[in-house]
Interface confidence: low
Amino acid sequence: EEELQMIQPEKLLLVTVGKTATLHCTVTSLLPVGPVLWFRGVGPGRELIYNQKEGHFPRVTTVSDLTKRNNMDFSIRISSITPADVGTYYCVKFRKGSPENVEFKSGPGTEMALGAKPSAPVVLGPAARTTPEHTVSFTCESHGFSPRDITLKWFKNGNELSDFQTNVDPTGQSVAYSIRSTARVVLDPWDVRSQVICEVAHVTLQGDPLRGTANLSEAIRVPPTLEVTQQPMRVGNQVNVTCQVRKFYPQSLQLTWSENGNVCQRETASTLTENKDGTYNWTSWFLVNISDQRDDVVLTCQVKHDGQLAVSKRLALEVTVHQKDQSSDATP
């Protein structure tokens, strides 16, 4: 018969107040003959947790039938866990002796500690929108977890980020801990549909990390590009001029037409379309009444996007009998 080993497979057992804890212990040999007892702590002050033969242990039950022939599983369950139950538990084999049993071998011990799950991570983005190519910061917070060991990762559209700083508080002993992490993310022009994800992994989550998300659409402003063009065909005394506002986000946009510096109040036709990347295009048509005797007309399309400074583009219509090519230039 091989030498007896006392196997306690768990080094650490995380338990929740009020729940039941299972402490595993198996032996590799039936010899020597004698009982297996459970203790908390070591040395003369150790506390007896379970003795099958004698004593009253109302919160302790065995996993296996200890009376079963050749039983080698001495695992126990402790119900209604309280903070007072934390400590290291040992299953100990005694050799039958006279007048009393003699301690023969102890398992390596299982540390029982109170575990608490982290709260769902909350991700907060910047207070104001920023344009592409700039860096914005996102914070992630999760609270109330124990033990202190925790892993936090950041992702942008599934790609792991590396530019972040994380703190776990407090640094000393505590019943519960909090984590706060700040990630720096460079915005790309196509990030309207992008997400940043904060992922928290903790031993209490049993391999299923918690995730918090933020949409970059809340943090990005994609400024528009403007183009003003004159339609080649004239219809009587009217010329159709188009202002195309491309690739902007968010949707908030004001467009005004000016004719020779005078803001035009009349209605104009327009359409709004959404691009695949989440940005928008706005097209506005303006009909200009012209006559051959009239002075040259300078049309200006002015766009105010998301409360920013207005940008404009102008088009000079040279109104002659033989209408010349249009020309377009930009104004700040």
């Epitope: 768990e10 590799t28 050749n70 080698m72």
Partner: antibody, heavy 114, light 108 residues
């Protein structure tokens, strides 16, 4: 002598079924949890399924959950693995092992091929 | 489920000491077991629990554990120790078992 002997392997088409058996001897079978572990050709070991001493608790790897069923018959000192909806990626040597994997069988080869 | 990570290959000079490591979150809570497998053979358990050796395993094999890392140490490696070594443990949920990818040990 402590021994585990697997049987039931063979060649089967994708979508087919096989039942593996493991005959235990030389130890008190119903004192131990048991596992099935597999090893694809040239690859590492992969735990497939486990069962406690009386069959009251079972566990499965995600890759086989819903397709494989582990069971045991303590009166016959036998462990079983019923494998349904077999796929090419299930091709492997299947080992029967005592839960802590202190004792292993020699394995039985399962080949899933058209 | 959890993962256990091992170095794919490690080499050691004959008679020297080598350490093979296994990392994973589940090892904070569970001890690893270690297996030796030679070509064409079934695996053999060499270390289990805190540092237990089955009978017949030479005492040059030992195990240790710290945080999320388990280690198998061979003190005075012999030619016959050349093999693949696998670690395993229960996963973080405690309901499943997970194996490391294996480490090929070459004795030079």
């Amino acid at each position: 002598e402590v021994q585990l002997v697997e049987s039931g392997g063979g060649v089967v088409r994708p979508g087919g079924s096989l039942r593996l058996s493991c005959a235990a001897s030389g130890f008190t079978f119903d004192d131990y949890g048991m596992s099935w572990v597999r090893q694809a050709p040239g690859k590492g070991l992969e735990w497939v399924s486990g069962i406690n001493w009386n069959g009251g608790s079972t566990g499965y790897a995600d890759s086989v959950k819903g397709r494989f069923t582990i069971s045991r018959d303590n009166a016959k000192n036998s462990l079983y693995l019923q494998m349904n909806s077999l796929r090419a990626e299930d091709t492997a040597v299947y080992y029967c092992a005592r839960w802590i994997a202190k004792v292993w069988g020699q394995g039985t080869l399962v080949t899933v091929s058209r | 489920s959890s993962e256990l990570t091992q170095d794919p290959a490690v080499s050691v000079a004959l008679g020297q000491t080598v350490r093979i490591t296994c990392q994973g979150d589940s090892l904070r809570s569970y001890y690893a077991s270690w297996y030796q497998q030679k070509p064409g053979q079934a695996p053999v358990l060499v270390i289990y629990g805190k540092n237990n050796r089955p009978s017949g395993i030479p005492d040059r094999f030992s195990g240790s554990s710290s945080g999320n890392t388990a280690s198998l140490t061979i003190t005075g490696a012999q030619a016959e120790d050349e093999a693949d070594y696998y670690c395993n443990s229960r996963d973080s949920s405690g309901n499943h078992v997970v194996f490391g990818g294996g480490t090929k040990l070459t004795v030079l």
